[in-house]
């Protein structure tokens, strides 16, 4: 694979994870109820990371925005953040990228130049798509812990009616913004990773391209290592550089989006 | 205006089929949740179906689940109840009604009267 | 399946008097997600269908009367009627509308002396 071709496609598969990192995080379904202990429920409750919403079989949904900073969870408020920070990283990442593309020409930037800023943008993108695999990935463990501790007391306070009457506490499982972030999130890293591969393509090798001219005893003649590269002339200016063919492929984008059912 | 408005309620011998529609008016069907409610000679209301809003899911009550089948055409406005393999005991007189906030049914139609009698 | 137990089955009252019915659930009503009950009261009149009167165990339905008011969470509602017309009696029914089956409770009947 050409170095250009690498970077351009480093960026699109960042930029497809990156616009799936802002969707997951704006999305309201992080959360869904668990519908196996009630499977035929009229209401169906789903929470995302800004407000929690109820959708009745009537075909009304009703959301709540989380309207408090202070009596929210830490962990809610740490995934929030860690979002947001693979969103900022993210547009910066794109812009710098965007600079950084072979295929764009900006003035007189030259290679090592762009090598940088091709880097730069590669390890905003690795660490935008480390920042939304965590984040995820905190919130579904918070999830599963708070699963098995409402399981273990699923039917609480056993009052009223002597007894006899079952309060069933809602549970809550993976929504489809979980999947979403994942798949987001190692878009965002595989793109990045290319990015940096593609850096390396772009960056100059100095004894490729630095004439060296030395005299021999009795002879003048000037010898350009690496100059007799297969047609590219004596006095070129062409630069030969490494192409990395290496393992920067995706699986053919084979990114699978979660349905979302409508359990109610 | 909206209106509901049943049709489709017979006399019929146990084991027979009767197809209920529900002609809905002042609003577009496929936006809510429908459900039929049937009133038995001795006064008692007794959900029946609900299919919700877009028509994804439907929910049968027990003593009419694999015999009755809930049902819409967008299009015409109109909500069905398709009903089969009728006993005694299915006879009511059946309501249609939209689903409103809370599930709570807004409006119902006057109903039709379903006899299932030898 | 919810069951719901209407109390009492009937009641004979005067016209003005304050009126109060009480409906139970065998599983708690109250939705975590909006803390909301999903119980619904309706009204209905000798050859008429049901009227909808209160949803939300307590948000009374836009042209009813402000003398009906419905209370409780949880398992344990109450629709009171503070003054009573003779329009008022009819058969009121309570409705879990929270889990399917959607079931109804038997009906107060409300009755003039």
């Known amino acids: 694979m050409s170095v250009t071709a690498c970077q351009g496609l480093g960026f699109v598969v960042s930029l497809i994870g990156f616009a799936g990192i802002i969707a997951a995080t704006c999305m309201d379904q992080w959360s869904t109820q668990d519908l196996y202990n009630n499977p035929v429920t009229a209401v169906f409750n789903y929470q995302g990371l800004w407000r929690s919403c109820v959708r009745e079989s009537s075909g009304f949904t009703e959301c709540r925005g989380y309207f408090t900073l202070l009596g929210l969870p830490a962990m809610l408020q740490a995934v929030r953040a860690l979002m947001i920070v693979g969103i900022v990283l993210g547009v910066i990442g794109i812009l710098v990228s965007i600079f950084a593309l072979k295929c764009i020409r900006i003035g007189s930037m030259d290679d090592s130049a762009k090598a940088k800023m091709t880097l730069t943008s590669g390890i905003l993108f690795i660490i935008s798509g480390i920042c939304a695999i965590i984040g995820v990935s905190v919130f579904a463990n918070m999830l599963v812990t708070n699963f098995w501790m409402s399981t273990a007391n699923m039917y609480s306070g056993m009052g009223g009616m002597g007894g006899m009457v079952q309060t069933v506490q809602t549970r809550y499982t993976f929504g489809a913004a979980l999947f979403v972030g994942w798949v987001a999130g190692g878009l965002t890293l595989i793109g990045g990773v290319m990015m940096c591969i593609a850096c390396r393509g772009l960056t100059p090798d100095d004894s490729n391209f630095k004439a060296v001219s030395y005299h021999a005893s009795g002879q003048n003649v000037a010898y350009r290592p690496g100059g007799f590269k297969a047609s590219t002339g004596f006095g070129s200016n062409t630069r030969n550089k490494k192409i990395y063919d290496g393992g920067a492929r995706t699986e053919d984008d084979e990114q699978s989006h979660p349905t979302k059912y409508d359990y109610v | 205006e909206v209106q509901l408005v049943e049709s489709g309620g017979d006399l019929v011998q146990p084991g027979g089929s009767l197809k209920l529609s529900c002609a809905a008016s002042?609003?577009?069907?496929?936006?809510?949740?429908m459900s039929w409610v049937r009133q038995t000679p001795d006064k008692r209301l007794e959900w029946v179906s609900t299919?919700?809003?877009?028509?994804?899911?439907?929910y049968y009550s027990d003593s009419v689940k694999g015999r009755f089948s809930i049902s819409r055409d967008n299009a015409r406005n109109t909500l069905y109840l398709q009903m089969s393999s009728l006993k005694s005991e299915d006879t009511a007189m059946y309501y249609c009604?939209?689903?409103?906030?809370?599930?709570?049914?807004?409006?119902w139609g006057q109903g039709t009267a379903v006899t299932v009698s030898s | 399946d919810i069951v719901m137990t209407q109390s009492p089955s009937s009641l004979t009252v005067t016209a003005g008097e304050k009126v109060t019915m009480s409906c139970k659930s065998s599983?708690?009503?109250?939705?975590?997600?909006?803390?909301?009950?999903?119980l619904t009261w309706y009204q209905q009149k000798p050859g008429q269908p049901p009227k909808l009167l209160i949803y939300?165990?307590?948000t009374r339905e836009s042209g009813v009367p402000d003398r009906f008011t419905g209370s409780g969470s949880g398992t344990h509602f109450t629709l009171t009627i503070s003054s009573v017309q003779a329009e008022d009696l009819a058969v009121y029914y309570c409705q879990n509308d929270y889990s399917y089956p959607l079931t109804f409770g038997a009906g107060t009947k409300l009755e003039l002396k």
């Open positions: 299919i919700i809003s877009g028509g994804i899911n439907t």
């Open positions: 002042g609003f577009t069907l496929s936006r809510y949740g």
């Open positions: 599983q708690s009503l109250l939705n975590s997600g909006n803390q909301k009950n999903y």
């Open positions: 009604g939209r689903l409103y906030y809370g599930n709570a049914m807004d409006y």
């Open positions: 939300w165990a307590s």
